[in-house]
């Protein structure tokens, strides 16, 4: 499947109100959700400590409070720069940014800007993508993922915080984005209702039924709270989620423990994956722009890479995702998307020519925008 | 320090059974993962079980699949393989493992204990 | 037969370097999954040296790496010592097979 090229507008359906958030990659791993290292002998596994490997690993400093209060990032976790690129080490060091973090909600009160002023931003995500304005930029080569097939153990952490469904993943996921390298440190889904769709991103306008984002840290960075709000500093791959006539095998050992963690703060553990299944198969062909996490804080300076191509659920499978998580207050989990962003002047770019495809609604071709890595 | 303890092996005739134990301590036991892995007489390593920290998740070489059955007591920090129908073949030093939280190697081994299947 | 192919032995003069293949297929390293190094001296258990392609748990010497590339991976030990002396064994995952090891390889020190 391909993205609809200038499709006539659909309602956005989705209950999301201007500032409406889903769990935003800005789920930024909290320290337990951040990988540590691994665990070859030589620290020496108190017990209750983790095992970590690694000559550089420092001993794990835990913040002194773990309480739903602070910051969130909950879910990008905060894994320490590697000197060696499979080793992060341990991520001790989470800022924690306020209390009123962890309190903001999809729709309805308190304002975004006011749980994070970086809401109010001029360069926030998501945005609509409209195929025939990217800016086609050859320098855009195919994407490379190192590390995202893994066996059955270590087991990973699947939970429910409240705001979307989030696996974290281990230590050495490594994309190369350009001429960076980018480490993989959770992913998690949006969704809407029955018969509402719930992706972040739209295409002309179109929204569809799901979307995932693979959340990851810049290299250049050695914890998430560093990379926050610096250019470049997060990246998240996002790809969207459509109906079709079978299961997906991939997502189905995700989806199918979903009731274990029906709860809002449960979790899982489930056995590891090729998480380069869940994502589309052409890496070749996708967007990208700099925008911001979809959630409170609202970050910016995060690389968005968005697929062309989509990821097909069977229709059980969706209603799966959208009608088995409950969130705050007695509350499903449903509609956990943040409205579109005005671009402000943003120009997304495009590995493939997208706007130069025909389509319907245009008779010549048009390409308006010019690549900015293009040039030399 | 982590230490993994090995103990159940000895001699036994082909078709017997024994249950090899293994036990841990100096770290989570229940948080990590948890192998067997044998070694005949002059012969290299071949893997044989593993489980999940929880024990919900069990997984067996085809050589002794229905044959072999790997569970955990994680309030007593013990690893167990259980070896049935043995044969000649299943003659090896067997070591527990432990694998790592994040990492699919093994991070920390027993010093093995010795199952001789003879007539 | 191994599912990883390893060579048997290799040798090398004290202060050399050797290096060690272990080539998979497209079902294991080629896969993607990582590899994982032990170290087996004569009468003891297996100790892990290298694990996730290329990282050393804590006490291994640096003069122990490992590299991967498309189906095959790589030990390399330079500043080749007395003590290094030993079976040499490569680990990954394997799509049908579950885990695997490589046959092991024997390094030996000439004198």
């Known amino acids: 499947q391909r993205l609809p090229r200038m499709q006539e507008d659909s309602p956005l359906g989705g209950g999301s109100s201007g500032e409406d958030d889903p769990l935003g990659e800005e789920d930024l791993p909290s320290e337990e959700d951040s990988p540590r290292e691994e665990d070859p002998p030589g620290e020496e596994d108190l017990p209750g400590e983790e095992d970590l490997p690694g000559e550089e690993d420092l001993p794990e400093v835990k913040p002194k409070s773990e309480e739903e209060g602070s910051l969130k990032l909950e879910d990008l976790p905060t894994v320490e720069a590697p000197g060696d690129p499979q080793e992060p080490q341990n991520n001790a060091h989470r800022d924690k940014e306020g209390d009123d973090q962890s309190h903001w909600r999809y729709g309805g009160d308190p304002p975004w800007p006011r749980v994070s002023p970086a809401c109010a931003g001029r360069f926030q995500s998501p945005v609509d993508i409209r195929p025939q304005l990217a800016a086609f930029c050859p320098a855009l080569r195919p994407l490379e993922l190192l590390g995202f097939q893994l066996p059955p153990l270590p087991e990973l952490r699947l939970r429910n915080n409240g705001h979307s469904v989030q696996l974290t993943l281990p230590p050495g996921l490594e994309m190369a984005l350009g001429p960076g390298r980018e480490y993989a440190l959770q992913l998690h889904l949006h969704w809407g209702a029955a018969g509402r769709p719930g992706s972040e991103h739209t295409v002309e306008g179109h929204r569809f039924p799901a979307e995932i984002h693979v959340v990851h840290l810049s290299t250049a960075f050695a914890r998430v709270d560093e990379a926050l709000g610096r250019p470049g500093g997060l990246a998240v791959l996002a790809a969207f989620l459509e109906e079709g006539p079978e299961e997906n095998s991939a997502y189905e050992q995700l989806l199918s423990r979903l009731e274990e963690i029906a709860e809002e703060g449960s979790e899982t553990q489930v056995p590891g994956l090729d998480i380069s299944a869940l994502l589309p198969s052409d890496f070749s062909r996708y967007f990208q722009y700099e925008g911001s996490l979809t959630t409170p804080p609202c970050a910016q300076g995060v690389i968005w890479t968005v697929f062309n191509q989509t990821v097909m659920l069977s229709a059980k499978q969706l209603h799966t995702l959208s009608d088995t998580l409950w969130g705050p207050g007695d509350s499903r989990l449903q509609l956990n998307f943040r409205a579109t962003q005005p671009l402000n002047g943003r120009v997304i770019e495009a590995s493939f020519p997208a706007g130069v495809d025909s389509s319907p609604r245009a008779a010549e071709p048009v390409q308006l925008n010019s690549c900015l890595a293009a040039g030399d | 320090q982590v230490q993994l303890q090995e103990s159940g092996g000895g001699l036994v005739q082909p078709g017997g059974s024994l249950r090899l134990s293994c036990a841990a301590s100096g770290f989570t036991f229940s948080s990590y993962a948890m192998s067997w892995v044998r070694q005949a007489p002059g012969k290299g390593l071949e893997w044989v079980s593993a489980?999940?920290?929880?024990?919900?998740?069990?997984y067996y070489a085809d050589s002794v699949k229905g044959r072999f059955t790997i569970s955990r007591d994680n309030s007593k920090n013990t690893l167990y393989l259980q070896m049935n129908s043995l044969r000649a073949e299943d003659t090896a030093v067997y070591y527990c493992?432990?694998?790592?939280?994040?990492?699919?190697?093994?991070?920390?081994w027993g010093q093995g204990t010795l199952v001789t299947v003879s007539s | 037969q191994s599912v990883l192919t390893q060579p048997p032995s290799v040798s090398g003069a004290p202060g050399q370097r050797v290096t060690i293949s272990c080539t998979g297929s497209s079902s294991n390293i080629g896969r993607g999954y990582n590899v994982h190094w032990y170290q087996q001296l004569p009468g003891t258990a297996p100790k892990l040296l290298i694990y996730d392609n290329t990282n050393r748990p804590s006490g291994v010497p640096a003069r122990f790496s490992g590299s991967k590339s498309a189906t095959s991976a790589s030990l390399a030990i330079t500043g080749l010592q007395a003590d290094d002396e030993a079976d040499y064994y490569c680990q990954s995952y394997d799509s049908g097979l579950r885990w695997v090891f490589g046959g092991g390889t024997k390094l030996t020190l000439l004198r």
């Open positions: 489980i999940s920290g929880s024990g919900g998740s069990t």
């Open positions: 493992a432990k694998i790592g939280r994040y990492s699919s190697s093994l991070g920390y």
